[in-house]
């Protein structure tokens, strides 16, 4: 079960730059709580020294990225996957979370998200081209398809608890961070507050329940006096700087 | 509009399997969580398994081993393997997911399993 | 797991009059700042439909008379005024910690 099995928390403001993407720290491990099996890839592994990133889904790569596999037809047939750079706007894309922030995948083309004339949860028709190229692509015989998907776009940001694919589709003060099986939009963590340290090296993955990262002006840090047999478990507090 | 229709209910022995489909529509359902939930004849509910968009799975220690969540993103369709099925899985099965918020804010109509000698 | 008690196990409003349902959690289901408790309403033969999420939040098309409270460990649902339409099941449900967890429900019947 869950009780021994560390999950590698993945920073969510800033993570490693693997192949032009945002710069910043990767995770720490965590535990996550007990009673619930849990079934991912290769997500225990650390991977001190290895760059870019591998990932089984967007989730686990940053804001500016998505997850995929780096060559055509890979993905599906057990291709290593990894955090790509995301799609700027007129580039092919599959799915929402190909596009950079601002963007939204509309007929296989990353769109500028236009505020005026989506109100949110509008849901629209889109014509996905899927070029087998992707981790959503079945596996087979690598020819296009093309696969009509219903995409809900939101053009307002998300208040806390709404669903989110990245911190840009929430409202000031919120973050887009793992909860459950899902992203929602949480509150940035106010000075005090406990946060999660994120310090070793490439050990990039997921976690069940994500922090969002400090606001303006502080800095995750071990809580002065607080002192504990061991390192690991000392509390880290969002501080001054 | 957004549609959960789920099928594959039935009856079945103890011991026996089945396996449970849930055709989704209305929204892109490669980027969405989904999970099964389960009412009980008392009318109790028990989450059952959920998977992320990306294919990570969770279970319940009620039904892990024997049961299996997996999703084809390409038809759209969400799927609950059971296994070593006991008397206590009887229920009405649902599929759910969350769309606008974290809590489960689209649900099936569902899909009964009577597990009965 | 969080045990979720919900009280009264069934109550009879008169049409027009307040309906309050209760929820108590075993420990507190706040975290990250959001209280992750839910509400549902269940009407026969049909699946669980949300009514409240994060407390007090309302879900899509659910009508002002339906409103969440409370934080930490308890909650309750309040239902005004109560309309013929409103007899159902109601059940809260936590999602501040894995597995999700119900309560037992309370059935509303209006008099």
């Known amino acids: 079960t869950l009780n021994s099995v560390l999950i590698n928390s993945n920073a969510i403001k800033n993570l490693p730059p693997p192949l032009g993407g945002a710069g910043g720290q990767p995770g720490s491990a965590v535990s996550v709580a007990p009673g619930v099996l849990y079934e991912g890839g290769n997500k225990y592994q650390t991977l001190d020294n290895y760059q870019p990133y591998p990932c089984a889904e967007d989730e686990e790569c940053g804001s500016d990225e998505y997850c995929s596999s780096p060559s055509r037809g890979a993905a599906g047939v057990g291709g290593v996957q990894i955090c790509l750079a995301c799609r700027k706007r007129r580039k092919r894309c599959m799915r929402h979370a190909m596009c950079c922030p601002g963007n939204y995948c509309k007929n296989g083309i990353c769109m500028p998200s236009d505020h005026s004339h989506f109100p949110r949860g509008e849901i629209e028709e889109s014509i996905i081209e899927n070029l087998g190229n992707d981790h959503n692509a079945a596996a087979g015989d690598g020819y296009p398809r093309r696969t009509t998907l219903t995409s809900k776009i939101y053009h307002t940001k998300g208040q806390e608890g709404s669903v989110c694919l990245r911190s840009s589709d929430c409202a000031a003060g919120l973050c887009c961070a793992r909860h459950f099986w899902s992203k929602i939009c949480k509150p940035v963590l106010k000075e005090g507050q406990v946060c999660t340290k994120h310090k070793r090296k490439g050990s990039h993955g997921l976690e069940i329940f994500q922090r969002c990262y400090c606001g303006e002006g502080l800095a995750c840090r071990i809580q002065k006096d607080h002192h504990q047999a061991s390192n690991s478990s000392r509390l880290h507090t969002c501080q001054r700087h | 509009e957004v549609k959960l229709v789920e099928s594959g209910g039935g009856l079945v022995k103890p011991g026996g399997s089945l396996k449970l489909s849930c055709a989704a529509s209305?929204?892109?359902?490669?980027?969405?969580?989904m999970s099964w939930v389960r009412q009980t004849p008392e009318k109790r509910l028990e989450w059952v398994a959920s998977?992320?968009?990306?294919?990570?799975?969770y279970y319940p220690d009620s039904v892990k081993g024997r049961f299996t969540i997996s999703r084809d993103n390409v038809r759209n369709i969400l799927y609950l393997q059971m296994s070593s099925l006991r008397s206590e899985d009887t229920a009405m099965y649902y599929c759910?997911?969350?769309?606008?918020?974290?809590?489960?804010?689209?649900w099936g109509q569902g899909t009964s399993i009577t597990v009965s000698s | 797991d969080i045990v979720l008690t919900q009280s009264p196990a069934s109550l009879a409003v008169s049409l027009g009059q307040r309906a309050t349902i209760s929820c108590r959690a075993s420990e507190s289901v706040d975290d990250f700042g959001i209280s992750f408790m839910n509400w549902f309403q269940q009407k026969p033969g049909q699946p669980p439909k949300l009514l409240i999420y994060?407390?007090?939040k309302q879900g899509s098309g659910v009508p002002a008379r339906f409103r969440g409270s409370g934080s930490g460990s308890d909650f309750s649902l309040t239902i005004h005024p109560v309309e013929e339409d409103d007899t159902a099941m109601y059940f809260c449900?936590?999602?501040?910690?894995?597995?999700?967890?119900f309560g037992g429900g309370t059935k509303l019947e209006i008099k």
């Open positions: 998977i992320s968009g990306g294919g990570d799975t």
């Open positions: 994060a407390a007090s």
């Open positions: 209305g929204f892109t359902f490669s980027n969405y969580a």
């Open positions: 759910a997911t969350s769309l606008e918020n974290y809590a489960m804010d689209y």
């Open positions: 449900q936590q999602s501040k910690e894995v597995p999700p967890t």
